[in-house]
């Protein structure tokens, strides 16, 4: 029937047998071994009836044997119930008393055993685990059940396994049975395939930069299957990741800040049962120098009818690799002074009196000037010339 | 504190001319530049013309640079506007404006006393 889970394939060891033969003329009945004797070493194989949740002892003898109380049809003890013990007193016609009393320990039913995929999914890619799970209660004495597993040829006796440094992306089979009193009452196969693995490194071809706020990068894909990249570019602490498709093979970097060092990272990855990151290609560049950014809090003091005093903070962008601020300073449209120095404060002295002048400060990084920060401011009349021609009054 | 009081504005046809005024009162000594200042309708306030007041240098915006002209009167405290070949673009509430002292810009932030406005429309 459908019903029954064949639940064993013990080997069978024949009922031993004799036969005596004479050497007389006379014939003479042979002795009929007594059935304690014959079926001494029966072994019994166990079926379960998922129905009705009750086992079937098959007893592996070669001749139909009765079974004193218990009927037994076909040499099949039913309706056994699990982990309890029933008695059978075996005889045959071919042998005598006293009968073979046979103790069947039934194991506990079949789907209190469930064969459980333990593999942990980070590392899924090189490990297999397989483990028997007991997910009911029995009253059978646990220290009486064996579990054993076969995977290819390597052989484990015990109630969970691990399988390391696999293969990714292969198929491993392994058997599993389990045993009570060493009688296989259950068994299970399974066919696990590994999972996808981490994919290669990106082969970088080259990385550069040819402007001040742009550069590019172009790469090999990696060998292993990926499902799309990850590109990094970090400036000193500022990190930005993009998510690329898998097609792509070269990537345009925009609104980059200028003369300022990118270090790259292209890795692949693969979204399997997690996300597994290949190793990252490295690589980095300096963009181009720009124009630096306007000076800024720019003061104009007087310190004197004729004498002024210049400052201004740094630019917040200064684009370029050196470091100098210049002043202009022009009356009219007449520059009447260019001077430049290491810091953005200046001293400006002997002006005209009394002359509206304009004062332009602005950064040079050494390749480019910055926008100049304009601020006006007028002189004074000399008053030591009013106060010594007003004293001779 | 300066206190500013402008004059002159009105309703002009496309292509005319008006002449504002502003009179100056108060701290006027400690200013170094006066200037006038517009806002049209639904526009941020715009720098249109400044004059330098001891140098008397002068500054224009370029959209008017050719066709306005600011000048001063010292001894009366007073700075003019004049505006010749007026545009329609040209309409807008204009402001006298005074400098804090010290060293200045174009930029209104600059300028610390204000006067009330002068409305000029030019109609096309």
């Known amino acids: 029937s459908d019903a029954y889970l064949n639940a064993s394939e013990t080997t069978t060891l024949s009922p031993s047998g004799s036969a005596v033969i004479s050497t007389t003329t006379i014939a003479t009945t042979p002795s009929k071994p007594t059935c304690d004797e014959k079926y001494a070493n029966i072994t019994v194989d166990y079926l379960y009836n998922k129905e009705t949740k009750l086992f079937t002892a098959k007893l592996n003898v070669n001749e139909n044997v009765e079974c004193g109380n218990n009927t037994c049809t076909n040499n099949e003890v039913h309706n056994l119930t699990e982990c309890k013990n029933a008695s059978v007193s075996i005889s045959h016609n071919s042998c005598t008393a006293p009968d073979k009393t046979l103790i069947l320990d039934v194991p506990p039913g079949v789907e209190k055993f469930q064969l459980h995929d333990c593999t942990q999914v980070e590392k899924a890619d090189t490990t297999i685990c397989l483990k028997w799970k007991n997910i009911e209660t029995f009253t059978c004495d646990t220290q009486n059940i064996t579990y054993r597993f076969q995977c290819g040829n390597m052989i484990f006796d015990n109630k969970e396994i691990k399988l390391e440094n696999l293969e990714p992306e292969h198929e491993y089979k392994c058997d599993s049975e389990i045993l009570y009193n060493n009688h296989k009452f259950t068994n299970a196969s399974k066919i696990i395939k590994t999972d996808f693995g981490s994919p290669g490194e990106p082969q970088i071809i080259f990385c550069r930069s040819e402007a001040a706020h742009q550069g590019v990068i172009t790469w090999n894909p990696p060998q292993r299957s990926f499902h799309n990249f990850t590109l990094c570019y970090i400036k000193e602490t500022e990190k930005d990741c993009l998510n690329l498709d898998k097609n792509l093979i070269k990537y345009d970097l925009q609104n980059l800040k200028p003369y300022t060092k990118y270090v790259l990272s292209l890795h692949a990855y693969i979204i399997a049962k997690v996300q597994r990151n290949g190793s990252a290609a490295m690589c980095h560049f300096t963009t181009k120098s720009a124009p630096p950014s306007q000076v800024w809090n720019m003061t104009v003091s007087m310190t004197s009818d004729n004498s002024m005093h210049v400052k201004c903070r740094p630019p917040r962008d200064r684009n370029g690799p050196h470091e100098r601020y210049h002043l202009e300073v022009e009356a009219g449209n007449t520059l009447v002074r260019n001077e430049s120095h290491k810091n953005c404060d200046f001293r400006v002295k002997d002006l005209q009196y009394s002359t509206d002048y304009t004062f332009k400060a602005y950064f040079h990084n050494g390749d480019y000037p910055g926008e100049p920060f304009i601020l006006h401011h007028s002189t004074s009349y000399n008053s030591k010339a009013h106060h010594h021609h007003h004293h001779h009054h | 504190q300066v206190q500013l009081q402008e004059s002159g504005g009105g309703l002009v046809q496309a292509g005319g001319s008006l002449r504002l005024s502003c009179a100056a009162s108060?701290?006027?000594?400690?200013?170094?530049?006066m200037g006038w200042f517009r806002q049209a309708p639904g526009k941020e306030r715009e720098f249109v013309a400044a004059?330098?007041?001891?140098?008397?240098?002068?500054y224009y915006a370029d959209s008017v640079k050719g066709r306005f002209t600011i000048s001063r009167d010292i001894s009366k405290n007073t700075i003019y506007l004049q505006m010749n070949s007026l545009k329609p673009e040209d309409t807008a509430l204009y402001y006298c404006a005074a400098t804090n002292g010290g060293a200045w810009h174009y930029h209104e932030r600059y300028f610390g006393s204000w006067g009330q406005g002068t409305l000029v429309t030019v109609s096309s």
């Open positions: 108060g701290r006027t000594f400690s200013t170094h530049a």
């Open positions: 004059i330098a007041w001891s140098g008397g240098s002068t």
